[in-house]
């Protein structure tokens, strides 16, 4: 056969689907690799061919589209399972070709099992809700295209093993789940089960997502530098180790980049010759507010180092702040004999 543009195994599209549920999988060629869509390709006389390699096998084989009740079918650029079985797990390839053109890509499909509380190896999307922010909603994801708009499915929402009913502040509203006022206790995994009829059969779609309650933008403030501050003076003798922590609190801000850095005499530590090390640690509160600590360390400080300006800087989407550390050289204690002599007025 003639050469085919092989895009290899697209591991970025690690598709996971639940056992015994419908799954519709679009050929990734048209979404990520080619500059034209399926309709254009079809109009140009190109044919889409599907085949697969079973898990732990090397042999590529055609997909059996003649199974009872059309369990596996193809519609335009979509491969349908109605429903999936555990042994459908494998690498699937879609190939677009005619006599003069060929392009193909493979992708892994994993059929996973869930337990009665919807626990599974499925990677869960995370939806962040602002704490005490008023009504916020999550929507049952990835159910488009499974049934026509004329079909009215039933949707049941669960938190873990439990149907969401009579909750204080969470109300199921069809495809949406409304949080009247999100609290820390609302953190967790939420599952929607969509049930719909098709050709005399009943199918279920299960979708689980993780809700994480985070700090509200209403409460967000610019970075707060807790250390260095005006109350602590770093007083050292030459030869001692100088350790100055810069501790900064950042309110949670969606998609904000939090930065902390030191300057020494107005320059970044990398741009000066002194032997300085910076160690950073990060901790988060339950609402994902962040505390960053950068410890500036000079193993053997010189009298010259003790005259420098050490400034901690912090920046987030809410603003930029800076604070200088109070560093000074320790005055050596006067020698005992001299002190006595001076005390008696000796010359």
């Amino acid at each position: 056969s003639e050469r085919c543009d092989d895009w290899g195994l697209d591991t970025m599209r690690q598709i996971q689907v639940f056992e015994d549920e419908p799954a519709r999988i679009k050929c990734p060629l048209f979404e990520h690799f080619l500059k034209f869509n399926y309709s254009t390709a079809h109009s140009a006389g190109l044919t889409l061919i599907w085949y697969w390699t079973r898990q732990d096998r090397d042999l590529e084989e055609p997909i059996n589209f003649r199974l009872p009740e059309n369990r596996i079918s193809k519609e335009k650029d979509v491969l349908w399972f109605r429903p999936t079985l555990l042994n459908d797990t494998g690498n699937y390839t879609c190939m677009l070709r005619n006599t003069t053109y060929c392009s193909k890509v493979a992708f892994p499909l994993e059929v996973v099992q869930k337990d009665s509380c919807f626990n599974s190896p499925m990677k869960l999307p995370v939806h962040k809700l602002y704490i005490e922010y008023g009504i916020q909603r999550i929507t049952c994801p990835n159910v488009d295209g499974y049934f026509p708009s004329s079909v009215k499915p039933t949707i049941t929402w669960y938190m873990g093993c439990y149907k969401i009913q009579n909750f204080n502040n969470v109300i199921p509203e069809g495809m949406n789940l409304s949080f009247l006022i999100a609290l820390i206790s609302n953190n967790g995994n939420y599952t929607c089960v969509v049930t719909y009829p098709e050709n005399g059969r009943t199918f279920h779609l299960t979708r689980t997502l993780t809700v994480k309650v985070v700090g509200s933008p209403k409460n967000a403030v610019p970075p707060v530098i807790h250390s260095p501050n005006d109350h602590v003076v770093y007083e050292k003798e030459p030869g001692e180790e100088l350790l100055i922590p810069c501790t900064v609190y950042f309110s949670f801000l969606m998609d904000s980049r939090n930065e902390v850095w030191w300057t020494i005499d107005g320059k970044k530590p990398d741009d000066i010759t002194i032997d300085v090390t910076i160690n950073e640690s990060i901790s988060h509160s339950r609402t994902e507010d962040e505390t960053r600590t950068q410890i500036l360390s000079i193993k053997k400080v010189t009298s010259e180092d003790l005259k420098r300006s050490y400034v901690c800087h912090a920046r987030s989407a809410k603003g930029e702040v800076a604070k200088a550390a109070k560093v000074k050289q320790k005055v050596p204690a006067p020698r005992y004999t001299v002190e006595l002599a001076c005390g008696f007025g000796a010359t």
Epitope: Y162, Q165, G188, N189
Partner: antibody
Framework: QVQLVQSGAEVKKPGSSVKVSCKAS????????IQWVRQAPGQGLEWMGY????????DYAQKFQGRVTITADESTSTAYMELSSLRSEDTAVYYC???????????????WGQGTLVTVSS | EIVMTQSPATLSVSPGERATLSCRAS??????LAWYQQKPGQAPRLLIY???TRATGIPARFSGSGSGTEFTLTISSLQSEDFAVYYC?????????FGQGTKVEIK
């Protein structure tokens, strides 16, 4: 170690109500459900309903709808089961039980209270 | 609701012998089945969940098997402390339901 401690035995007249308490010791890391199960003398176990104290969610078995009310006081880590319009066949030991989390499939009854005997007699 | 039927109602076994208890569901419950042990005057204790997974601290002589509608609890070598009533429970569908129990007594 989480423990569930229930209130003491009760003797009630037919037509009256009883309220059994179940206090949890050990603060949970995340939401959990308290289940109520009863057992008539010499009989099997019968699930009555549950409550999720931190979220307020609850549900009751069809058989007890309209007669049972399960509530919780988060501040004292105590759940309550109230059964009204008592009749002699409600004579039973009433148990509360719980799991560690809302997500533990098959382990929603892994910690049990000691049981509360409710006798309904005229 | 799903009806759970246990058999036999009473099982007479000598210490050291094997005991096999059955539980049947009126419809498939997949592997969503638990077993509990209850001794006189005590609360039930979780033995097995997921049809075959032993709960924390349960001795290896207790094992569970089955899926769908037919389940078995096996006690490989009965100890004196194992004489009790055993209940199965399905948690596949609400309401969660228990079997009527099997009493394991000393022969």
């Amino acid at each position: 170690q989480v423990q569930l401690v229930q209130s003491g035995a009760e003797v009630k007249k037919p037509g009256s109500s009883v309220k059994v308490s179940c206090k949890a010791s050990g603060s949970p890391a995340e939401p959990y459900a308290i289940q109520w199960v009863r057992q008539a003398p010499g009989q099997g176990l019968e699930w009555m309903g549950y409550i999720i104290p931190s979220l307020g969610g609850y549900d009751y078995a069809q058989k007890f709808q309209g007669r049972v009310t399960i509530t919780a006081d988060e501040s004292t880590s105590t759940a309550y089961m109230e059964l009204s319009s008592l009749r002699s066949e409600d004579t039973a030991v009433y148990y509360c039980a719980r799991g560690q989390t809302l997500y533990a499939s098959g382990r929603q009854f892994d910690i049990w209270g000691q049981g509360t005997l409710v006798t309904v007699s005229s | 609701e799903i009806v759970m039927t246990q058999s036999p109602a009473t099982l007479s076994v000598s210490p050291g012998e094997r005991a096999t208890l059955s539980c049947r569901a009126s419809q498939s419950v997949s592997s969503n089945l638990a077993w509990y042990q209850q001794k006189p005057g005590q609360a039930p204790r979780l033995l097995i969940y997921g049809a075959s997974t032993r709960a924390t601290g349960i001795p290896a002589r207790f094992s569970g098997s089955g899926s769908g509608t037919e389940f078995t609890l096996t006690i490989s070598s009965l100890q004196s402390e194992d004489f009790a009533v055993y209940y199965c429970q399905q948690y596949n569908n609400w309401p969660w339901t228990f079997g009527q129990g099997t009493k394991v007594e000393i022969k």
